[in-house]
């Protein structure tokens, strides 16, 4: 039975040439995370992190993201195509997978707040 | 409860174009993120496009870039899936979905809360 929460940043804003932190948080289960991955609405892989074996960021984003915090991810350098989804999937034994929404809105405005705050999607 | 009612489905020669209406009804339909998924025979459900409520954000598939456009009337309740250069591999049922709430696009299916019935769009020549 799978009684775990994913909690997010929810929804997000920032500044076009900035950066941004990624965070999906599971709460309510002591199941074991074996791995995180990072995607976008697109299907494509940001980057995993195993428990074994740490992280791996995917080629096309190895210049605009890092690892962490914790289980989170960084997206730098934000360009206006980065707005959309991400989506975070907790695989955990013996629960299952575990998934979470994030929606960032890249803005051109300079004076773009950064806004975040955590949810559930 | 809100209720989903797809039209416009048919069939079409390879190369034309179809329009997709999906009344709702029964709810706020101005807040509601929308999309639309098809299904194709023997094949997975899949995401083809989706609308913010306030029409700012859109998804499109891949396959369907530049090909389809999704649109939405607020003050008529209705959600729009223009489709040009319709192809053989188009053919599919496709169903319209509504989130009760929610910022942005949602371009998957597990996060939507009420769905149509679907309407069979078939491209043969």
């Known amino acids: 039975m799978m009684t775990g929460t994913i909690e997010t940043t929810g929804n997000i804003s920032a500044k076009k040439g900035g950066s941004v932190i990624l965070q999906c948080h599971l709460s309510s289960t002591m199941a074991q995370v074996t791995q995180v991955n990072w995607e976008q609405h697109d299907h494509s892989l940001l980057a995993i992190r195993n428990a074994e074996l740490g992280w791996h960021i995917y080629p096309a984003f190895k210049d605009r993201v890092a690892p962490g915090p914790g289980l989170g991810l960084t997206l730098q350098s934000l360009t206006m195509n980065d707005t959309g989804e991400y989506f975070c999937t907790y695989h955990t034994y013996p629960d299952g997978t575990y998934r979470g929404r994030i929606f960032l809105e890249v803005l051109e405005s300079s004076v773009a707040e950064h806004s975040a705050r955590f949810q559930i999607p | 409860q809100v209720q989903l009612v797809e039209s416009g489905g048919g069939v079409v020669q390879p190369g034309r174009s179809l329009r997709l209406s999906c009344a709702a009804s029964?709810?706020?339909?101005?807040?509601?993120?929308m999309g639309w998924f098809r299904q194709a025979p023997g094949k997975e459900r899949e995401s083809v496009a989706a609308?913010?409520?306030?029409?700012?954000?859109?998804y499109y598939a891949d396959s369907v870039k530049g090909r389809f456009t999704i649109s939405r009337d607020n003050s008529k309740n209705t959600l729009y899936l223009q489709m040009n250069s319709l192809r053989a591999e188009d053919t599919a049922v496709y169903y319209c979905a509504a989130r009760d709430s929610g910022v942005g696009y949602y371009s998957r299916a597990q996060w939507y809360d009420y769905w149509g019935q679907g309407t069979l769009v078939t491209v043969s020549s």
């Open positions: 609308i913010s409520s306030d029409m700012r954000f859109t």
């Open positions: 029964g709810g706020s339909f101005s807040s509601y993120p």
